[in-house]
Interface confidence: medium
Amino acid sequence: ELCDDDPPEIPHATFKAMAYKEGTMLNCECKRGFRRIKSGSLYMLCTGNSSHSSWDNQCQCTSSATRNTTKQVTPQPEEQKERKTTEMQSPMQPVDQASLPGHCREPPPWENEATERIYHFVVGQMVYYQCVQGYRALHRGPAESVCKMTHGKTRWTQPQLICTGEMETSQFPGEEKPQASPEGRPESETSCLVTTTDFQIQTEMAATMETSIFTTEYQ
């Protein structure tokens, strides 16, 4: 079952999944100037059996200027460098969730992939939060969120993490407090977590993969 809302936003924090539950989709997105090959997959899908999980489908990008040439999937070093790093910077890493049964590891990059990865999570997925550079964590509890099913609706649990500017606790003179993120959620929206969207995806994920809920084709 797909999680039909997004993990909660913590001001001045990012989140990262350490592994992805079976059923997770990852968009096959290409960087500017490139597009998916005509017959290529829209997404990769984490699938598996009781002993092994892996990503089905391969993402392939081709130059928007060319028609029939496909690019090899193995990324070149310079292209790997070009991708934004999505790894958490903290030395404090959670337990390697990728070793859990029913989970896929982070897929390797593909050539000319977009700079940001777009995942569609499923119930049971856990994501971990970390404060961005310039902010420090004040923990009241676990800095993680789990997508849960309650009374037929999905919701993400609230991570117990506050990210505070280092200036607020530091004694160093001349230190500037980092500017507040312009992307923070307005206060009126902080109680949205248990609210799910009106257009919930009720059907099984396998049955909805190629439907108009997710996909619109070029005319």
Epitope: R36, L42, P186, T216
Partner: nanobody
Framework: EVQLVESGGGSVQAGGSLRLSCAAS?????????MAWFRQAPGKERDFVGS????????SYADSVKDRFTISRDNAKSTVYLQMNNTKPEDTAVYYC??????????????????????WGQGTQVTVSS
């Protein structure tokens, strides 16, 4: 990539209502995109009106339209809507639909700056007369 086409613009009396639609097309996963409405009055900057996260969980509005405008989306129809109630003459503008790519690792529920939106529609004119 996603292509956006607005519709529903027109003329309305002050205090009246109008509903704008923005249909998305393209070989893409529509629920990958956060959506927004902006507007541009003659001789002015293009201003943020409201935005909605990819599953409609989170919304944000400009102060000038709060409690009057409502943004919603229907992922099954690949469409985002702007319901304009209690319109005012100062709402007169070209209204643009915009989309940004959601990112699972570097995440923000709502974006309010036009530079953060990669995809734009052509706009639809709304005229509110007194």
């Amino acid at each position: 990539e996603v292509q956006l086409v607005e519709s529903g613009g027109g003329s309305v009396q002050a205090g009246g209502s109008l509903r704008l639609s923005c249909a998305a097309s393209g070989r893409t996963l529509y629920s990958s995109y956060g959506m927004a409405w902006f507007r541009q009055a003659p001789g002015k900057e293009r201003d943020f009106v409201g935005s909605i996260s990819r599953y409609g969980t989170y919304t944000s509005y400009a102060d000038s339209v709060k409690d009057r405008f409502t943004i919603s989306r229907d992922n099954a129809k690949s469409t985002v809507y702007l319901q304009m109630n209690n319109t005012k003459p100062e709402d007169t503008a070209v209204y643009y639909c915009a989309a940004y790519t959601y990112s699972g690792s570097f995440y923000s529920t709502v974006k309010t700056h036009r530079d953060e939106y990669q995809y734009w529609g052509q706009g639809t004119q709304v005229t509110v007369s007194s």
